[in-house]
Amino acid sequence: AFGISGVQKYTRALHDSSITGISPITEYLASLSTYNDQSITFALEDESYEIYVEDLKKDEKKDKVLLSYYESQHPSNESGDGVDGKMLMVTLSPTKDFWLHANNKEHSVELHKCEKPLPDQAFFVLHNMHSNCVSFECKTDPGVFIGVKDNHLALIKVDSSENLCTENILFKLSET
């Protein structure tokens, strides 16, 4: 395990990573739920969207999110070719023209309407820390992940590799 300095080290270069190409390598329409099987839902209220984490009633339809996957080249820190590897970044769009954004000042996750090219706040580095779960790390704030706090999505600072496995930053993607 890395310890605190290790997490900072492996995420530090996120700021410098460049997304290769402006079009996603693939897209995937899925419902998003927490590790504990609560659904992430989106509701239009007063001309803006709110994001909720809630238990759905039986047979209630889950909201779908379009995940767009982008390759991002990572600057080298030990290999001679200038590129150390590739990261997978995603954007999440529950409805046309709206994307999840990281608001790092407020430590919140918000839905913003915007045009392409999308701002960096809309990109999240995809992690697997569990066989069938994913985590979303802010491109703009390495070490900060989308998580669940008080039945809402929030930005949660992860300060050691052990905490990468905490349930509140783990999400399940499902086609149903």
């Epitope: 395990a1 890395f2 290790g6 492996y10 390598i25 693939t26 995937y28 899925a30 996957y69 390759e71 990572h74 820190n77 030990e78 290999s79 150390d84 590897g85 590739k86 990261m87 997978l88 580095v125 995809l126 992690h127 697997n128 820390m129 569990h130 066989s131 069938n132 994913v134 790390e137 590799s161 052990e162 990468l164 496995c165 993607l173 086609e175």
Partner: antibody, heavy 122, light 107 residues
Framework: EVQLVQSGAEVKKPGASVKVSCKAS????????MTWVRQAPGQGLEWMGS????????YYPDSVKGRVTMTRDTSTSTVYMELSSLRSEDTAVYYC???????????????WGQGTLVTVSS | EIVLTQSPATLSLSPGERATLSCLAS??????LAWYQQKPGQAPRLLIY???RLQDGIPARFSGSGSGTDFTLTISSLEPEDFAVYYC?????????FGGGTKVEIK
């Protein structure tokens, strides 16, 4: 240049254990999931398990669960696969592989070790 | 577990011909599907990932397509070095699984 160099061939008796090593170089070892795949003589490919980039999680198929253990040593950039209670059907070439992307398992396995033949015979 | 069924088991073709290999999944999944080529005595080589992305260094005569449960690897014009065994593999759901393979042999 990415390299995965595995330990040499092993001959074991049924009931014994074997530990195969895979030394990685040419990339940031701490950022990648590592996976083991085996191939019995004349047969197809079988997933043997994966270990997360931090080493904090391991995942194995039911077919070998309880007999296989994967570990990684960040100080030497080496991943290990130990298989116990060996039987004749474990005779295979064992490959270590590296994931395509930092931090996750998406996108297949672009890098493979040269393979380690493990023969189980009495 | 997702079972991947490859067909045909053997494909007999001549150099210059087009090869179409199928991989059928027992259930739908995101397109985390990869294709590998393996020659005797060698480790598998990644050709295609994300169902249709060409891996670096792989010739453009290889292409992948499909989604859901039905995936295809196409070799537009077979070269002598393309005669080998081809495997599909899904990474979407654990356990990770491979197809049984398709052998492309010289007719």
């Amino acid at each position: 240049e990415v390299q995965l160099v595995q330990s040499g061939a092993e001959v074991k008796k049924p009931g014994a254990s074997v530990k195969v090593s895979c030394k990685a170089s040419g990339f940031t070892f701490n950022n990648y999931w590592m996976t083991w795949v085996r191939q019995a003589p004349g047969q197809g490919l079988e997933w043997m398990g994966s270990i997360t980039y931090t080493g904090g999680g391991t995942y194995y198929p039911d077919s070998v669960k309880g007999r296989v253990t994967m570990t990684r040593d960040t100080s030497t950039s080496t991943v290990y696969m130990e298989l116990s209670s060996l039987r004749s059907e474990d005779t295979a070439v064992y490959y270590c592989t590296r994931a395509n992307y930092y931090y996750n398992t998406y996108g297949g396995f672009p890098y493979w070790g040269q393979g380690t033949l493990v023969t189980v015979s009495s | 577990e997702i079972v991947l069924t490859q067909s045909p088991a053997t494909l007999s073709l001549s150099p210059g011909e087009r090869a179409t290999l199928s991989c059928l999944a027992s259930e739908g999944f995101s397109n985390d599907l990869a294709w590998y080529q393996q020659k005797p005595g060698q480790a598998p080589r990644l050709l295609i990932y994300a169902a249709s992305r060409l891996q670096d260094g792989i010739p453009a005569r290889f292409s992948g397509s499909g989604s859901g449960t039905d995936f295809t690897l196409t070799i537009s014009s077979l070269e002598p070095e393309d005669f080998a065994v081809y495997y599909c593999q899904q990474g979407s759901k654990y356990p990770l699984t491979f197809g049984g393979g398709t052998k492309v042999e010289i007719k």
